[in-house]
């Protein structure tokens, strides 16, 4: 069953190469436990940059060595990338699964473009 | 190891009300649902209910609904069914079990059932 | 509600033979993300339910591999390759597809 899911169109990462979005999915049940995955489409291939599951009420928790950290609020997962190097310019598609209850639904965001510049090393001062 | 402890068997009356605890331990206990299921005598297993123990969010069969509250103390690690307005028919064996998403939330552990006997 | 309907009630079984149990449901359990949702459960005599297979022919951790699980659907069975003492219970079906999660009626399974 599909589930609509909204993000931002583009970001801009920080000068320490970090990006946060929003990921927004209209519930159309009761989810009380839910799996957020970000996936990275460049160059027509798609990769899993990171995925949590997390029950409502309680933390949303990344593996140790992710590159992703988050926090949730109702129906928003609040998502931050960070490390992130001007190569990693691309798309982040924010991909959401209510896991339960049944039944299963699936929403998929239309992206968001996340831009990163690498910062201009300092001049050497003489 | 993981543990579901039950409270002990209840004998009520009709119209009484019934309140079940099932204390866990061996794991976190936010971290997954509990469920309860009932098997009246003889019979097979029904499906009543579950709750997210970190918000007290539920999901209830509606043929229990407005009688069956399930409520958790996170403080103690229980899980508590109380059943309200018994009726003879609510005579059966409950049990609380622990959802594992690994299993796509099937029942992995079960407590060893509370026997509720509803009689006048 | 999904109803599901277990095949035989009741079934004798010889140790060392194998034995099958067929459950059915009234609404395909098979998922367009490719999961079937369909458990099975034994509970053996004097004893709490216990999970064998999830997702349908996966084995729950510590499950003898004398079990398996199999079908389509709507249409499945559970398989015991050589049937031993400590098998006898009844087993039972069960669906997450939907809420209320639903179980089959029970297959008893005795020694002859």
């Known amino acids: 069953k599909a589930m609509h899911v909204a993000q931002p169109a583009v970001v801009l990462a920080s000068s320490r190469g970090i990006a946060s979005f929003v990921c927004e999915y209209a519930s159309p049940g009761k989810a009380t436990e839910v799996r957020v995955t970000v996936l990275r489409q460049a160059d027509s291939q798609v990769t899993e940059v990171c995925a949590a599951t997390y029950m409502m009420g309680n933390e949303l928790t990344f593996l140790d060595d992710s590159i992703c950290t988050g926090t949730s609020s109702g129906n928003q997962v609040n998502l931050t990338i960070q490390g992130l190097r001007a190569m990693d310019t691309g798309l982040y598609i924010c991909k959401v699964e209510l896991m339960y209850p049944p039944p299963y639904y699936l929403g998929i965001g239309n992206g968001t473009q996340i831009y990163v510049i690498d910062p201009e090393p300092c001049p050497d001062s003489d | 190891q993981v543990q579901l402890v039950q409270s002990g068997a209840e004998v009520k009356k009709p119209g009484a009300s019934v309140k079940i605890s099932c204390k866990a331990s061996?794991?976190?206990?936010?971290?997954?649902?509990i469920n309860w299921v009932k098997q009246a005598p003889g019979q097979g297993l029904e499906w009543i209910g579950d709750?997210?123990?970190?918000?007290?969010?539920?999901n209830s069969n509606q043929k229990f609904e407005g009688r069956a509250t399930l409520t958790v103390d996170t403080s103690i690690s229980t899980a508590y069914m109380e059943l309200s307005r018994l009726r003879s028919d609510d005579t059966a064996v409950y049990y609380c079990?622990?959802?594992?998403?690994?299993?796509?939330?099937?029942?992995?552990?079960w407590g060893q059932g509370t026997l509720v006997t509803v009689s006048s | 509600d999904i109803v599901m309907t277990q095949s035989p009630l009741s079934l004798p079984v010889t140790p060392g033979e194998p034995a099958s149990i067929s459950c059915r449901s009234s609404?395909?359990?098979?998922?367009?993300?490719?999961?079937?949702?369909l458990y099975w459960y034994l509970q053996k005599p004097g004893q709490s339910p216990q999970l064998l297979i999830y997702?349908?022919?996966n084995l729950a951790s510590g499950v003898p591999d004398r079990f398996s699980g199999s079908g389509s659907g709507t249409d499945f069975t559970l398989k015991i390759s050589r049937v031993e003492a400590e098998d006898v219970g009844v087993y039972y079906c069960?669906?997450?597809?939907?809420?209320?999660?639903?179980f089959g009626g029970g297959t008893k399974v005795e020694i002859k």
């Open positions: 079990a622990r959802l594992r998403r690994e299993y796509f939330y099937a029942m992995d552990y």
């Open positions: 061996g794991y976190k206990f936010t971290d997954h649902f």
């Open positions: 709750i997210n123990p970190n918000n007290g969010g539920t």
């Open positions: 609404k395909s359990l098979l998922h367009s993300n490719g999961i079937t949702y």
């Open positions: 997702q349908m022919s």
């Open positions: 069960a669906q997450n597809l939907e809420l209320p999660l639903t």
